[in-house]
C-alpha cells in the first residue's frame, strides 16, 4: 500500500525524486563509458516520517518499531520503487557497444 | 551486481538482517490482529559502505556521489531484497481469517 | 531485436507536405539516451541528415530545411514522425529512419522512396 | 554548419589490397567522426565510432584514426563484401552532416 503523500516537514523535504548532474569521472565511469559525458542521474532522498509513501506492511512495521526504539530500528529510507532504462556507449575490447541499464535511474520513490 | 559481502567497519555493523521481538501493541496490531501475540520481525539494518551489498547499479552511483557530495546525496541504504511470508489470524466483521502477508518479513538484505 | 521501418506516400506534389512514419520495435523512446533520426538520400547521391527526436523531445533540425520540417513521437505506439512542408523536386529521395545512441546511429529501417511530381 | 570533405569520391582495388580514405572536416570536431559503409539497394551500416571505435560486430579489418580536423579510415585487406560506398559524418554539433562518399569499385 502506497501510503499519504503528504510531508509534515514540510514541502520539498520527504522521500522524493531528484536530479543530481554528474560527469563520468564523477560516477567513476570515465575508464569504460565513452558517452554520455553527463548524465541526469535521478535518485531517491528525503526523509520518511510516519507512514509517508510506505512501500508495504514491512515498512509500517518499520516505523511503528523505530518510534518505540529509536536507537535500534532506524526509520524506512527513501528508495526507488521503480526506474527508468539508459543506454550507454561503452568500451569493449574490440571497440564500443550499446548498452541499456534498467537499473540505473530512479523513476520513483517510496519509503522502506 | 550484488557487490562484496565483506564489512569494512566491524563483523556485524554493515547491512545485514536482524531479528527484533514486537508485540501486537508495540505494532499497533492490537486491534485487528488475534494471533500471534507476538512477532519475531526479521528486518535489514546497518551501514552501507561503499560497494557493499551494492543492489544495482543505482547503488553503486548513489556510493560515488555520496562520496563526492555527502551533503547532498545520502549514502545507500540497508532494505530487504526479499521477503518471507506470514500469516496473520485476523478479526474480520463475521469472526477470524487466516491471511498471508508477502512483505512484512525480510529475508535478506542488501544496499540501495 | 531492433527494427525500424518506414512509410510514406511514394508520390507526393509540389508544394505539399510529404508526411512519413517511423515504426519501430526492439527499443523505446522512454529509454534515456534514446533517439530517432531522419536521414535522406537523393537518388546517386549521398545522405543529408535532416532531423531527429530524443527520449526526452528535445528536437534536432538540418539547418537549411528548419522552417519546413516538423518531428514528433509516440513513445507509446513506437513511432516516430516527420512532416516536411512545401516539397519540391529537389526533395524527391529515399528517405531513412535510424535508431540513435547518444551520437550513433546504429540500426536503419529499410528506407522508403518518395517522388515529388505533378 | 562543419562541411564534411572527403577524397576520393572513388577508387578501384582488388581483393586483399590496403584502402584509405580520408575525410577533412571545415572546424575542429574533436574526435566526433562516425564511418558507414553502404551497398547498393541497401541503408546504411554503422562501423566507427568517434574516429577510431568500431562497432559491436564489425570486423577489425576496419579501422579509423584521426582527431580535429583530419580522419582516415582504412580497409587493411579488403575482401569481395566490401565493396561498396563509406561516408564519413561528424557527430560533433547539431546539425549532422556527412561526407559525399567514397566508392570502392573492384580493380
Known amino acids: 500500500a502506497r501510503n499519504g503523500d503528504h510531508c509534515p516537514l514540510g514541502p520539498g523535504r520527504c522521500c522524493r525524486l531528484h536530479t543530481v548532474r554528474a560527469s563520468l569521472e564523477d560516477l567513476g565511469w570515465a575508464d569504460w563509458v565513452l558517452s554520455p559525458r553527463e548524465v541526469q542521474v535521478t535518485m531517491c532522498i528525503g526523509a520518511c516520517p510516519s507512514q509517508f509513501r510506505a512501500a508495504n506492511m514491512h515498512a509500517q512495521i518499520k516505523t511503528s518499531l523505530h518510534r518505540l526504539k529509536p536507537d535500534t530500528v532506524p526509520a524506512p529510507c527513501c528508495v526507488p520503487a521503480s526506474y527508468n532504462p539508459m543506454v550507454l556507449i561503452q568500451k569493449t575490447d574490440t571497440g564500443v557497444s550499446l548498452q541499456t541499464y534498467d537499473d540505473l535511474l530512479a523513476k520513483d520513490c517510496h519509503c522502506i | 551486481a550484488r557487490n562484496g559481502d565483506h564489512c569494512p567497519l566491524g563483523p556485524g555493523r554493515c547491512c545485514r538482517l536482524h531479528t527484533v521481538r514486537a508485540s501486537l501493541e508495540d505494532l499497533g496490531w492490537a486491534d485487528w490482529v488475534l494471533s500471534p501475540r507476538e512477532v519475531q520481525v526479521t528486518m535489514c539494518i546497518g551501514a552501507c559502505p561503499s560497494q557493499f551489498r551494492a543492489a544495482n547499479m543505482h547503488a553503486q552511483i548513489k556510493t560515488s556521489l555520496h562520496r563526492l557530495k555527502p551533503d547532498t546525496v545520502p549514502a545507500p541504504c540497508c532494505v530487504p531484497a526479499s521477503y518471507n511470508p506470514m500469516v496473520l489470524i485476523q478479526k474480520t466483521d463475521t469472526g477470524v481469517s487466516l491471511q498471508t502477508y508477502d512483505d512484512l518479513l525480510a529475508k535478506d538484505c542488501h544496499c540501495i | 531485436q531492433v527494427t525500424l521501418q518506414e512509410s510514406g506516400p511514394g508520390l507526393v506534389k509540389p508544394s505539399e507536405t510529404l508526411s512519413l512514419t517511423c515504426s519501430f520495435s526492439?527499443?523505446?523512446?522512454?529509454?534515456?539516451?534514446?533517439?530517432v533520426g531522419w536521414i535522406r538520400q537523393p537518388p546517386g547521391k549521398g545522405l543529408e541528415w535532416l532531423a531527429h527526436?530524443?527520449?526526452?523531445?528535445?528536437?534536432y533540425f538540418n539547418t537549411a530545411l528548419k522552417s519546413r520540417l516538423t518531428i514528433s513521437k509516440d513513445t507509446s505506439k513506437n513511432q516516430v514522425s516527420l512532416k516536411l512542408s512545401s516539397v519540391t523536386a529537389a526533395d524527391t529521395a529515399t528517405y531513412y529512419c535510424?535508431?540513435?545512441?547518444?551520437?550513433?546511429?546504429?540500426?536503419w529501417g529499410q528506407g522508403t522512396s518518395v517522388t515529388v511530381s505533378s | 554548419d562543419i562541411v564534411m570533405t572527403q577524397s576520393p569520391s572513388s577508387l578501384s582495388t582488388s581483393v586483399g589490397d590496403r584502402v584509405t580514405i580520408t575525410c577533412k572536416a571545415s572546424?575542429?570536431?574533436?574526435?566526433?567522426v562516425a564511418w558507414y559503409q553502404q551497398k547498393p539497394g541497401k541503408s546504411p551500416k554503422f562501423l566507427i565510432y568517434?574516429?577510431?571505435y568500431r562497432y559491436t560486430g564489425v570486423p577489425d579489418r576496419f579501422s579509423g584514426s584521426g582527431s580535429g580536423t583530419d580522419f582516415t579510415f582504412t580497409i587493411s585487406s579488403v575482401q569481395p563484401e566490401d565493396f561498396a560506398v563509406y561516408y564519413c559524418?561528424?557527430?560533433?554539433?547539431?546539425?549532422?552532416?556527412f561526407g559525399g562518399g567514397t566508392k570502392v569499385e573492384i580493380k
Open positions: 572546424q575542429d570536431v574533436n574526435t566526433a
Open positions: 526492439g527499443f523505446s523512446l522512454s529509454t534515456y539516451g534514446i533517439g
Open positions: 559524418q561528424q557527430h560533433y554539433s547539431t546539425p549532422w552532416t
Open positions: 527526436i530524443w527520449w526526452n523531445n528535445n528536437k
Open positions: 568517434s574516429s577510431s
Open positions: 535510424a535508431r540513435m545512441g547518444y551520437d550513433i546511429m546504429d540500426y
